[in-house]
Interface confidence: medium
């Protein structure tokens, strides 16, 4: 077995980092491979072990427990096949952050002519991402997802108000939200679970 190139790693910056390796042949990741990793701050910390699983016949993925990361953290990692080291390297969780997807996306009637969307940021107040995340809200027609509006929410509060009449009346719409860090390098989270609602408002007399 040979490792092809470097792994792709990202961290949710709260409890888990995920690395994915491409191999030169089909492999049963969990029985043939083993990943050892340790936080380099503790020079004599215990080696932690992650048992990879297959994400494809020649691709192994490992979800490593990394409790409460800080910006300076760096992990030493070694991928082994029985008694042979296939790869070694290091990973900084703060260097490639893919935040947890928001949840509890909810639509509220704000005032008569506005909708209010709220969602939950899943990071506690002692985590750097608690006040750092920016959001992207995607609102699309349920019957035609290619027709959509995107709102970039650059303020900290997980909420968005928008006029009811910016959308068509008598149409079902779907909303979803994702987040990313402003301070740390990384990518957008996965999209949150979506919500769907029926957009209805009374047209002004002149438009009826």
């Amino acid at each position: 077995i040979k490792v092809l190139g470097e792994p792709t790693c990202f961290s949710d910056y709260i409890r888990t980092s995920t690395c994915e390796w491409f191999l030169d042949s089909a492999v049963d990741c969990s029985s043939q491979l083993c990943l050892h990793y340790r936080l380099m701050f503790f020079e004599f910390s215990e080696n932690l072990t992650c048992i990879p699983r297959n994400s494809a016949s020649t691709v192994c993925v490992c979800h490593m427990e990394m409790n409460r990361p800080v910006q300076s953290d760096r992990y030493q990692m070694e991928l082994w096949a029985e008694h042979r080291q296939l790869w070694q390297g290091s990973f900084s969780p703060s260097g490639n952050v893919k935040p947890l997807a928001p949840d509890n996306l909810t639509l509220h009637t704000n005032v008569s002519d506005e909708w209010l969307l709220t969602w939950n940021n899943l990071y506690p107040s002692n985590n750097l991402l608690y006040k750092d995340l920016i959001s992207m809200v995607n609102i699309s027609r349920e019957d035609n997802p290619a027709e959509f509006i995107v709102y970039n929410v650059t303020y900290k509060e997980p909420r968005l108000s928008f006029p009811i009449n910016i959308l068509m009346s008598g149409v079902y719409y779907t909303a979803r939200v994702r987040v990313r860090s402003q301070i740390l390098t990384g990518t957008w989270s996965e999209w949150s679970p979506s919500i769907t609602w029926y957009n209805h408002f009374q047209l002004p007399l002149i438009q009826r």
Epitope: F42, F44, S45, E46, R68, V70, Q71, S72, D73, L128
Partner: antibody, heavy 124, light 107 residues
Framework: QVQLVESGGGLVQPGGSLRLSCAAS????????MNWVRQAPGKGLEWVSA???????RYADSVKGRFTISRDNAKNTLYLQMNSLKPEDTAVYYC??????????????????WGQGTLVTVSS | DIQMTQSPSSLSASLGDRVTITCQAS??????ISWYQQKPGQTPKLLIY???RLQTGVPSRFSGGGSGTSFTLTISGLEAEDLATYYC?????????FGQGTKLEIK
């Protein structure tokens, strides 16, 4: 509150052996690294050895191969087995609990709590 | 191994004075240094960790600074109870090492 109580010190001849103990209370002993630090009479502090919660060890060059640090997490006790003792090992031996703190940017460690010490005298 | 050179080895100062103790590391240790106070006949006590972070319960007249290889402990407004020997400790790499100590006397 956190308490560390050393015992086992005394007078020993050069070449002899001694085992120091440090009884810990007031914290989850197995979760913390522990250290031995010594101080020769009228001199400064010298770090001697450390052991992680899981038993990984480190030593100062001056004691490597002669001293062995160990711990019994069930008994909340830290040990220092000292062999082939020399007159220059004469000192007060302190056990110290490692503390850890992290902010957004980095992690910090330090010797957070110290015992009162036990005197080891190596003399003929 | 990293050597910590502490200076001065002793100093005498008057009550209310501003006192600075320096520790020089033989190589860069980032901010991984802590400072300890040992009063006569007592066990050492943690004052500062991470070069500049004050341990809970330590008076605010104590402060730490520096980075890389040069670090300082400052007492602004010396009090009689500060009579002690002060030590720096590098915990950047094994083996840990203390400075030689600075004995602070009150004039």
């Amino acid at each position: 509150q956190v308490q560390l109580v050393e015992s086992g010190g005394g007078l020993v001849q050069p070449g002899g052996s001694l085992r120091l103990s440090c009884a810990a209370s007031g914290f989850t002993f197995s979760s913390y690294a522990m250290n031995w630090v010594r101080q020769a009479p009228g001199k400064g502090l010298e770090w001697v050895s450390a052991i992680s919660g899981g038993g990984s060890t480190r030593y100062a060059d001056s004691v490597k191969g002669r001293f062995t640090i160990s711990r019994d997490n069930a008994k909340n006790t830290l040990y220092l087995q000292m062999n082939s003792l020399k007159p220059e090992d004469t000192a007060v031996y302190y056990c110290a609990k490692s503390g850890f703190y992290s902010d957004y940017e980095r992690r910090y460690r330090y010797l957070e709590v110290w015992g009162q010490g036990t005197l080891v005298t190596v003399s003929s | 191994d990293i050597q910590m050179t502490q200076s001065p080895s002793s100093l005498s100062a008057s009550l209310g004075d501003r006192v600075t103790i320096t520790c020089q590391a033989s190589q860069s240790i980032r901010p991984e240094i802590s400072w300890y106070q040992q009063k006569p006949g007592q066990t050492p006590k943690l004052l500062i960790y991470g070069a500049s972070r004050l341990q809970t319960g330590v008076p605010s007249r104590f402060s730490g600074g520096g980075s890389g290889t040069s670090f300082t402990l400052t007492i602004s407004g010396l009090e009689a109870e500060d009579l002690a020997t002060y030590y720096c400790l590098q915990d950047y790499s094994w083996p840990y090492s203390f400075g030689q100590g600075t004995k602070l006397e009150i004039k």
